[in-house]
Amino acid sequence: DAEFRHDSGYEVHHQKLVFFAEDVGSNKGAIIGLMVGGVVIAC
């Protein structure tokens, strides 16, 4: 399990990054809304 070996000065990692630029779009928060009279109402 070399990935999580503890060396001094390092910690086990927990965060997940958007590493590949092509994933930027798929990791933006989804916006769900209803179009009413030309205005988007969040729902």
Partner: antibody, heavy 112, light 112 residues
């Protein structure tokens, strides 16, 4: 905690096949592109296959094109690499990687 | 494909002294979101690569603050302010702005 665990490596004869698997956990697998990267003994890092988050776009370098196939099962949080027509020069440690995280690697040895 | 060129390829260092590695890309790494997806990894002997710096200058979690990254466009630098014994290994720059993901040749850092 993010983890990537490869399996399926081993010794295979030239011309043979192997299927590598990578079990992902600790993150929303279906949102991220994934890759297989290999490292021949004493050499640098070489991308062998890349797949986008939904699995409908793949990339292979000329060295493996037509022989290797990357795929993913987002329901099972698993990445695969099907390797056919293996050659001696495919001998390497194969890593499953999301970029920021890498598995421990699985050794593939192609030899008669 | 984007070609990543590192220099030097070998770097003998003195404990407690600074060290610097350069990385140049064959084309701009600026993505449409304004970020450059240029990253630095360290691979210690017998281990998987580990992410140190992402998107030019951001330290990954758990990475000591003696590591820093800088640069823009096509020219990037990794600096270690004071080298420690645990910093030996092979450092790779890589880009993930463009498909395919590509790597530099690696810079081997060793203690004099």
């Amino acid at each position: 905690e993010v983890q990537l665990v490869e399996s399926g490596g081993g010794l295979v004869q030239p011309g043979g096949s192997l299927r590598l698997s990578c079990a992902a956990s600790g993150f929303t697998f279906s949102r991220y592109s994934m890759s297989w990267v290999r490292q021949a003994p004493g050499k640098g890092l070489e991308l062998v296959a890349q797949i986008n988050s939904v699995g409908n776009s793949t990339y292979y370098p000329d060295t493996v094109k037509g022989r290797f196939t990357i795929s993913r099962d987002n329901a099972k949080n698993t990445l695969y690499l099907q390797m056919n027509s293996l050659r001696a020069e495919d001998t390497a440690v194969y890593y499953c990687a999301s970029g920021d995280y890498w598995g421990q690697g699985t050794l593939v040895t192609v030899s008669s | 494909d984007v070609v990543m060129t590192q220099s030097p390829l070998s770097l003998p260092v003195t404990l407690g002294q600074p060290a610097s590695i350069s990385c140049r890309s064959s084309q701009s790494l600026i993505y449409s979101d304004g970020n450059a997806y240029l990253h630095w990894f360290l691979q210690k002997p017998g281990q998987s690569p580990r992410l140190l710096i992402y998107k030019v200058s951001n330290r990954f979690s758990g990475v000591p603050d003696r590591f820093s990254g800088s640069g823009s466009g096509t020219d990037f630098t990794l600096k270690i302010s004071r080298v420690e014994a645990e910093d030996v290994g092979v450092y790779y720059c890589s880009q993930s702005t463009h498909v395919p993901w590509t790597f530099g040749q690696g810079t081997k850092v060793e203690i004099k």
